[in-house]
């Protein structure tokens, strides 16, 4: 069986997971891309996806998940803002390519969210949690529903997941809270 690797991200409640998924530019630039969670005994569940065809650097927000597809750089940026303990789990980034199977973009992400130092996880006003300004977004729908596949079966390419530098929209309170550890199943 193919050994699937995981990258472990440890973050505090209220922080932002920021992952970049590389893809082959010429092949997949306009393909629809998705962020999925994998739970034990469950099929991968699509939590959010880009439009079809995917638009260049056009943020799509579904709840606390923001996807941005940068065609010029061949990468999908996935952010989960205001993290909560229940967000902990195993995630993956995929490209839809019907009628073929979705294509996994990078090693799976093992997200571990722990309670922060702040006593009130829900409010940013008086805590050291993330300050996040929501960018203009394109859709409130999870995915355009005429796009079909959902499950991932291919072996993943080498991971290119990384922690991005905080910018004007995302302010991580403590970037050293992020630990990346390759984990082998």
């Amino acid at each position: 069986a193919t050994k699937l690797t995981e990258e472990k991200y440890e973050l505090k409640e209220g922080q932002t997971l920021d992952v970049k998924c590389d893809y082959t530019l010429e092949k997949f630039a306009s393909s629809q891309k998705a962020w999925q969670i994998i739970r034990d005994g469950e099929m991968p569940k699509t939590l959010a996806c880009t439009e079809r065809p995917s638009k260049n650097s056009h943020p799509v927000q579904v709840g606390r998940i923001i996807l941005e597809d940068y065609h010029d750089h061949g990468l999908l940026r996935v952010r989960m803002v205001n993290l909560q303990v229940e967000d902990s789990g195993l995630y993956q980034c995929v490209i839809y390519q019907p009628p073929k199977e979705p294509h996994m973009l990078f090693d799976r992400i093992r997200l571990v969210v722990t309670k922060g130092f702040s006593g009130t996880p829900g409010s940013n006003e008086n805590s050291t949690q993330n300050v996040y300004k929501i960018p203009p977004t394109t859709t409130k729908a999870l995915c355009p529903l005429y796009t079909s596949p959902r499950t991932v079966t291919q072996a993943p390419p080498k991971s290119t997941a990384d922690v991005s530098t905080p910018d004007s929209e995302i302010n991580l309170t403590n970037v050293t809270d992020i630990i990346r550890v390759p984990v082998f199943n």
Partner: antibody
Framework: EVQLVESGGGLVKPGGSLRLSCAAS????????MNWVRQAPGKGLEWVSS????????YYADSVKGRFTISRDNAKNSLYLQMNSLRAEDTAVYYC???????????WGQGTMVTVSS | DIVMTQSPDSLAVSLGERATINCKSS????????????LAWYQQKPGQPPKLLIY???TRESGVPDRFSGSGSGTDFTLTISSLQAEDVAVYYC?????????FGGGTKVEIK
């Protein structure tokens, strides 16, 4: 037109076997996860089994685990349910249903009746 | 397993009146990160297969009349038919599709008073 058509139902004795088929048309079958759902006469709906688009993920309800086998042939646009060791309580209309990307069951077949009786 | 409890079992409503069906799940079907409730409503007329009406608890399926609406979040959900029509006579089921095994409510039979 998007369509699912079940076949293979009928009358079978307890302990017997049946193989249900579901023929899909009007959509890219190989891209969708599929399901079997059953409904006993005068009763509600019960999920039976699910299979992912390329058969990598397969799940069953506890009530049929070890007796039923779900499979698919994407080249033939077909979904199957092999039912062994049938019991009276398996008597039901069996529907195949398509799973959409949001995970709801958006397209259902007309159903095929399975009667288990001696 | 998530248990889905529907109420009432049956409902008789006059034509043009409002029909309200409730569904309660034994645990939350709200996915916090994308703020989606993995709950659907289906309509089943006699001798026919179920038909998807509402998904994500409140999003109407394409082609479904706007007199049908879904609401609620977490564990408590409602299907409302704002003005009952003769063709709405059917059994209505809620379903959670958050966790396997996917489970349905017991159904609510809607009839004309």
């Amino acid at each position: 037109e998007v369509q699912l058509v079940e076949s293979g139902g009928g009358l079978v004795k307890p302990g017997g076997s049946l193989r249900l088929s579901c023929a899909a048309s009007g959509f890219t079958f190989s891209s969708y996860s599929m399901n079997w759902v059953r409904q006993a006469p005068g009763k509600g709906l019960e999920w039976v089994s699910s299979i992912s688009s390329s058969s990598s993920y397969i799940y069953y309800a506890d009530s049929v685990k070890g007796r039923f086998t779900i499979s698919r042939d994407n080249a033939k646009n077909s979904l199957y349910l092999q039912m062994n060791s049938l019991r009276a309580e398996d008597t039901a209309v069996y529907y195949c249903a398509r799973t959409r990307i949001d995970d709801s069951f958006d397209i259902w077949g007309q159903g095929t009746m399975v009667t288990v009786s001696s | 397993d998530i248990v889905m409890t529907q109420s009432p079992d049956s409902l008789a409503v006059s034509l043009g009146e409002r029909a309200t069906i409730n569904c309660k799940s034994s645990q939350s079907v709200l996915f916090s990160s994308n703020n989606k409730n993995y709950l659907a409503w289906y309509q089943q007329k006699p001798g026919q297969p179920p038909k998807l009406l509402i998904y994500w608890a409140s999003t109407r399926e394409s082609g479904v009349p706007d007199r049908f609406s879904g609401s609620g979040s977490g564990t408590d959900f409602t299907l409302t038919i704002s003005s009952l029509q003769a063709e709405d006579v059917a059994v209505y089921y809620c379903q959670q599709y958050d966790l396997l095994p996917y489970t349905f409510g017991g159904g609510t039979k809607v009839e004309i008073k």
